[in-house]
């Protein structure tokens, strides 16, 4: 069964720039991917990024760039105002869902903190199902 | 642009076997999977499997386990099919599609004919 | 097995509003997304894609073409039928293990 992982790379010469690369381990489908954050733009849960292996990337500020890295990996680059950056990232969580084939979906979430440089390798993070 | 050539039509005798091919080219081969549908006369569409040709990973719909046989040369970005112990059955037209779980691109079809 | 099940045909005037609908037996929606897909097939030629995840269309495809719906129920509407739409229709979910189509609907002109 899949497992999704998280990481979130914050660029070292530009605080207002980051970067969220998620994707999936073991084998399967991948029929879209959606990166998604919560507390970072508002209380709610912002959609940053809807990404189709066939038919394209949508985005949505403050996404500014989403691609795939790999068939099994996207990445999605972010960037706001130096301020409201460093003001908001501590309660920001990133989620990447994963909708596979014949697994279902898998979630995965990581909450990025001052003191968190982010995952320097792809390990699970929090992972949710819904099959 | 995304093409999917697939080989000639076949006439087979019930109990052979056939190899129906499927050369893909104007996309990353690798990033993929290769499905084969089956349609048969009555327009009915049948999934028969897929292969991913990355990983060499297949998955099979159960009915056609035994029957259908997926295969993949990167070198040459083609896809096959092998079809065994034939039936009248199996006569149909057979297609490649490239995609994830949606079919984006299709192959022209392959006509397979079983009969004695 | 998913079953999708499709009215066999439906006749319609140039010009005019064509609804062709597809029940699926068990819900295709997962998540927010509804995985289900829309393939036309002329007479002769290979399916191609209409629609995918239920009303996403992909690029190059008429704007005539839409589709709707969500659960068991959805829905392909071409608006306004032209002479070049006469073909089969087919639905297509990918929810499930194994992938399975409808059984097609045949657009014919009245």
């Known amino acids: 069964s899949p497992e999704v992982w998280v990481q979130v790379q914050m660029e070292a010469t530009n605080l207002s720039s980051f970067s969220v690369h998620c994707g999936v381990l073991g084998y399967s489908l991948i029929s879209l991917v959606t990166v998604s954050c919560e507390g970072f733009v508002d209380a709610g849960r912002t959609k940053l990024a809807v990404l189709h292996p066939e038919f394209g990337t949508q985005q949505w500020a403050p996404a500014r760039q989403a691609h795939w890295e790999t068939p099994n990996s996207v990445s999605v680059t972010l960037t706001m105002g130096q301020s409201k950056a460093r003001s908001s990232l501590a309660n920001t969580t990133f989620c990447c869902e994963f909708v596979t084939f014949p697994h279902g979906s898998r979630v995965a979430c990581r909450d990025l903190h001052r003191s968190d440089p982010g995952l320097s390798a792809p390990t699970p993070a929090l992972n949710l199902q819904a099959d | 642009q995304v093409q999917l050539q697939q080989s000639g039509a076949e006439l087979a005798k019930p109990g052979s076997s056939v190899m129906i091919s499927c050369k893909a080219s104007g996309y990353t081969f690798t990033n993929y999977a290769v499905h084969w549908i089956k349609q048969t006369t009555g327009q009915a569409l049948e999934w028969t499997g897929y292969i991913a040709p990355g990983s060499g990973v297949t998955k099979y719909n159960e009915k056609f386990k035994g029957k259908a046989t997926l295969t993949v040369d990167k070198s040459s970005t083609t896809a096959y099919m092998q079809l065994s112990s034939l039936t009248p059955v199996d006569t149909a037209v057979y297609y490649c599609?490239?995609?994830?779980?949606?079919?984006?691109?299709w192959g022209q079809g392959t006509l397979v004919t079983v009969s004695s | 097995d998913i079953v999708l099940t499709q009215s066999p045909a439906l006749a319609v005037s140039l010009g005019q509003r064509a609804t062709i609908s597809c029940r699926a037996s068990?819900?295709?929606?997962?998540?927010?997304?509804?995985?289900m897909q829309w393939y036309q097939q002329k007479p002769g030629q290979e399916p191609k894609i209409l629609i995918y995840?239920?009303?996403n269309l992909p690029s190059g495809i008429p704007a005539r073409f839409s589709g709707s719906g969500s659960g068991t129920d959805f829905t392909l509407t071409i608006d306004p039928v032209q002479a070049d739409d006469i073909a089969t229709y087919y639905c297509?979910?990918?929810?499930?293990?194994?992938?399975?189509f409808g059984s097609g609907t045949k657009l014919e002109i009245k």
């Open positions: 599609a490239s995609g994830t779980t949606r079919f984006a691109y």
């Open positions: 068990q819900s295709v929606s997962l998540s927010s997304y509804n995985l």
């Open positions: 297509q979910q990918s929810k499930d293990d194994p992938l399975t």
């Open positions: 995840d239920a009303s």
